[in-house]
């Protein structure tokens, strides 16, 4: 849990108890099981992919 009295993390970031700081949700691309990824918004939309030639 984030310590009481501390500012919430900014948009696009989430609190990491493992690191004791806010972490950019983009870092979940490197390590999706990091603890702060649970607090990140739903995964960003997948890149558009053509389903036909």
């Amino acid at each position: 849990e984030q310590a009481p009295g501390t500012a919430p993390c900014s948009r696009g970031s989430s609190w990491s108890a493992d690191l004791d700081k806010c972490m950019d949700c983009a870092s979940c691309r490197a390590r999706p099981h990091s603890d702060f990824c649970l607090g990140c918004a739903a995964a960003p939309p997948a890149p558009f992919r053509l389903l036909w030639p």
Partner: antibody, heavy 120, light 112 residues
Framework: QVQLVQSGAEVKKPGASVKVSCKAS????????IAWVKQAPGQGLEWIGE????????YYSEKFRGKATLTADTSTSTAYMELSSLRSEDTAVYFC?????????????WGQGTLVTVSS | DIVMTQSPLSLPVTPGEPASISCRSS???????????LYWYLQKPGQSPQLLIY???NRASGVPDRFSGSGSGTDFTLKISRVEAEDVGVYYC?????????FGQGTKVEIK
């Protein structure tokens, strides 16, 4: 440049304990995970656990829970792994490795390995 | 736990010829973000493992372009387009999808 330098080889008797060190340099020690990996003679790689040095929070493989204890000293940028109640099957090379948690994936860095021999 | 299975376990190669190693995971390594959390390492004799490929197909810094990774989901391949003498060692696949971090059994590549 990033470097992980491990302590030297150890020979221990069954039932004893051993503490292996991993000194980090070239980066902010508290910003990355240090993992520990076992390689028994002629065998593959086996994850033991990992530590977040800044907070001391640890994650262990079920197999090594109670066998290994991971700690870190931020004042010296050194991670430690203590193995207790040593048995012959604990004879192995033990590696520490820096693992990334950031978007710009910059690879894993490994220590040179520490050979621990358990023999009566 | 995710089980990683490699084949073959031994691979005799001829310098200048291509080589290929297969890795299969017991569950899909394709995350909802469309990234495959599959990694390839090479452990040269007497050395520590070194990262070759991350996230399925991305070469790590300093890795020669003769190494390439492909595949998705549960089936992955490491290819060496033209084997060189310095490529001998044991190749491991591993995942980074969750804990525990697990590795394949290793594929020993040696010169014929």
């Amino acid at each position: 440049q990033v470097q992980l330098v491990q302590s030297g080889a150890e020979v221990k008797k069954p039932g004893a304990s051993v503490k292996v060190s991993c000194k980090a340099s070239g980066y902010t020690f508290t910003d990355f995970i240090i993992a520990w990996v076992k390689q028994a003679p002629g065998q593959g790689l086996e994850w033991i656990g990992e530590i977040y040095p800044g907070t001391g929070r640890t994650y262990y493989s079920e197999k090594f829970r109670g066998k290994a204890t991971l700690t870190a000293d931020t004042s010296t940028s050194t991670a430690y792994m203590e193995l207790s109640s040593l048995r012959s099957e604990d004879t192995a090379v033990y590696f520490c490795a820096r693992r990334t948690i950031y978007y710009d994936y910059d690879g894993d860095y490994w220590g040179q390995g520490t050979l621990v021999t358990v023999s009566s | 736990d995710i089980v990683m299975t490699q084949s073959p376990l031994s691979l005799p190669v001829t310098p200048g010829e291509p080589a290929s190693i297969s890795c299969r995971s017991s569950q899909s390594l394709l995350h909802s973000n469309w990234i495959n959390y599959l990694y390839w390492y090479l452990q040269k004799p007497g050395q520590s493992p070194q990262l070759l490929i991350y996230q399925g197909s991305n070469r790590a810094s300093g890795v020669p372009d003769r190494f390439s990774g492909s595949g998705s989901g549960t089936d992955f391949t490491l290819k060496i387009s033209r084997v060189e003498a310095e490529d001998v060692g044991v190749y491991y696949c591993a995942h980074n999808l969750e804990l525990p971090w697990t590795f394949g059994q290793g594929t020993k590549v040696e010169i014929k």
